[in-house]
Amino acid sequence: ECVTQLLKDTCFEGGDITTVFTPSAKYCQVVCTYHPRCLLFTFTAESPSEDPTRWFTCVLKDSVTETLPRVNRTAAISGYSFKQCSHQISACNKDIYVDLDMKGINYNSSVAKSAQECQERCTDDVHCHFFTYATRQFPSLEHRNICLLKHTQTGTPTRITKLDKVVSGFSLKSCALSNLACIRDIFPNTVFADSNIDSVMAPDAFVCGRICTHHPGCLFFTFFSQEWPKESQRNLCLLKTSESGLPSTRIKKSKALSGFSLQSCRHSIPVFCHSSFYHDTDFLGEELDIVAAKSHEACQKLCTNAVRCQFFTYTPAQASCNEGKGKCYLKLSSNGSPTKILHGRGGISGYTLRLCKMDNECTTKIKPRIVGGTASVRGEWPWQVTLHTTSPTQRHLCGGSIIGNQWILTAAHCFYGVESPKILRVYSGILNQSEIKEDTSFFGVQEIIIHDQYKMAESGYDIALLKLETTVNYTDSQRPICLPSKGDRNVIYTDCWVTGWGYRKLRDKIQNTLQKAKIPLVTNEECQKRYRGHKITHKMICAGYREGGKDACKGDSGGPLSCKHNEVWHLVGITSWGEGCAQRERPGVYTNVVEYVDWILEKTQAV
């Protein structure tokens, strides 16, 4: 059962796993949610009746029954983890805590103009977990405007104390706001020879990389595969760090793989969700339950639905036994990973999918695309919406993309002459315009947010957000697309598609069926040569064939330029302007979404 509200002046008795320090009960709940075993917590707020050494303590708790006895205690705030909830979860914490000093290892001290600048510095520093900033009013003159960057083994403070005229806060890496590079490559036959901060068992290098990503101290990793010569180290995932933030030595070793934390790209790839099945593989751990199941998929479902289950092993039924049902072993461990991994015993193992909700919904794999042809099929581009105006008569106005359950990203130039959001309708999950009838359900638009620097499409800033009146329930035919990570600025996308119901050639009419075209990206330098009378800025991105023929066209404005990278679709561009329908063989010009990620997050996360 999902319980989101906090219980004031209440303490849960027993079940302690560990104690951490957090600046608020709300953040204690987040820490509990992300901890592999925590189901409940008790936080102690500052209070005259409470011992100051216990202020800001966050006790993480577990219980076989998923609940614990409650005791009344002033200043105690208790609650449940969000593990039991189905809604999207984020570790992003933008709060600034006034007059609190969050203790940790102060590894960097510098002058900053503001707390915001200090927070940005922390976000863009590979080691930083949180910071404390001494304001202009701080009593000690030499410490004023000092920004202390801090880290700890757990990523949370080692202590929190009251201190006048300072402010503290966390790195915004988990808010997708870091400018640090996103290095997705996994290097085969490579060992990073740096200090290990932890080690866990993992079935493959991808899981190892994802574990590294959500481990607070891990910057890179080395994984020893099941063919590794030393038996005791097979399937071992070594989580590593270094002072420089990069591996100091790379050693060539067969059957080992190494890679980097994906902290700077975690909003656009799954880092918690280990969805694969591992055949002829047994995961060992503490046994939670043994249940009969028809298949390994059914076993995974059982594990996902059991809140304490972290991983499972399924042993298929022996012929005609138990109505063809096999045994499903639901398991857990102290760190969420198997204590040992064995091969050759015939089991099929995997992980709970409960953690998938900690990843962005946009990272979910969609059904395979139909290659070739120009007409799309249902569910192929589930983020694509058709934006209609009802004035003077109802018609398709522009395309757009679902980026959140209440947010559509589109082009600013679509709203020329649109006086009010009341005349707009957003239709999602649509393949053919002819499906839209009087009684077709739509989303009303609560607010149009146009970039305040927008003047005309050709000058840039051609970006707008639509806040919907109601939320979108994600299904196979309507779900969000990932925004590109700022750390992905240097990625070269090779699988890009433009979609929309726009005209296929000049003076054509709107198409009934959603059209698609695969188009290559063109460098801005090349694009500038083709548009000599217009400035192609770094906030624009160009795409289109040299020989013409395939391009976005009028009516596709505001729609997505979607690029697939590492099996995840990213909204790389918004159809903005260009020579029109490829007749002059010019590339189309798109709003370069990665340059507006901060703006999008600022607008969509505003309280």
């Epitope: 005309m456 083709r530 217009h534 020579e579 002059r584």
Partner: antibody
Framework: QVQLQQSGAELVRPGTSVTVSCKAS????????IEWVNQRPGQGLEWIGV????????NYNENFKDKATLTADTSSSTAYMQLSSLTSDDSAVYFC?????????????WGQGTSVTVSS | DIVMTQTPKFLLVSAGDRVTITCKAS??????VAWYQQKPGQSPKLLIY???NRYTGVPDRFTGSGYGTDFTFTINTVQAEDLAVYFC?????????FGGGTKLEIK
């Protein structure tokens, strides 16, 4: 109908500057690019640069970067080209032209040309 | 910069003849080629754009063809008023560049 009316012929001294104007009429001035092209006596055509009157954006041929400055005044629908530090090499007929498409393309209307002679 | 090499430089023809001028680009310019006519003492006039599209009011004796790097401009039945210099121009990549011109003279 579309017309581009250029200023009259100029006889100027070396080292000085000259400004050639090009007044547009018969169309929406801000919606089309204005190009400048020169033609030295008995020679071919050479592109100098372009101005987008709608945005004020200019783009120059490398050979004319330090020679020509393009501006446009949308209120009077007039484009200007200033040529500086003139030498006898700059003696030529200078044309303004409108592009056929909003984003560039062939030049469909031309001014009558302005002859600039640099002589001491 | 893309170089447009135009041949021949001069053409001496009789009225009624068929005239062909060629233009070769130093790299592919796709379909972005235009042809202009410049009569003595006048400014250039656009005849053909996008290789083969005749501009408004241009007689159908003027035609263009080609693609990529090789382009041809043809006057099917030359008339006395066609005495002029003809230029090709690429508009594919900035800076736009012109061919050296072909001077057409009538015998």
């Amino acid at each position: 109908q579309v017309q581009l009316q250029q200023s009259g012929a100029e006889l100027v001294r070396p080292g000085t500057s000259v400004t050639v104007s090009c007044k547009a009429s018969g169309y929406a001035f801000s919606n089309y690019l204005i190009e400048w092209v020169n033609q030295r006596p008995g020679q071919g055509l050479e592109w100098i640069g372009v101005i987008n009157p709608g945005s004020g954006y200019t783009n120059y041929n490398e050979n004319f970067k330090d020679k020509a400055t393009l501006t446009a005044d949308t209120s009077s629908s007039t484009a200007y080209m200033q040529l500086s530090s003139l030498t006898s090499d700059d003696s030529a007929v200078y044309f303004c032209a409108r592009t056929y498409g909003k984003y560039g393309g062939a030049m469909d209307f031309w001014g009558q040309g302005t002859s600039v002679t640099v002589s001491s | 910069d893309i170089v447009m090499t135009q041949t021949p430089k001069f053409l001496l023809v009789s009225a009624g003849d068929r005239v062909t001028i060629t233009c070769k680009a130093s790299q592919s310019v796709s379909n972005d080629v235009a042809w202009y006519q410049q009569k003595p003492g006048q400014s250039p006039k656009l005849l053909i754009y996008y290789i083969s599209n005749r501009y408004t009011g241009v007689p159908d004796r003027f035609t263009g063809s080609g693609y990529g790097t090789d382009f041809t401009f043809t006057i099917n039945t030359v008339q006395a008023e066609d005495l002029a210099v003809y230029f090709c121009q690429q508009d594919y990549s900035s800076p736009p560049t012109f061919g050296g011109g072909t001077k057409l003279e009538i015998k």
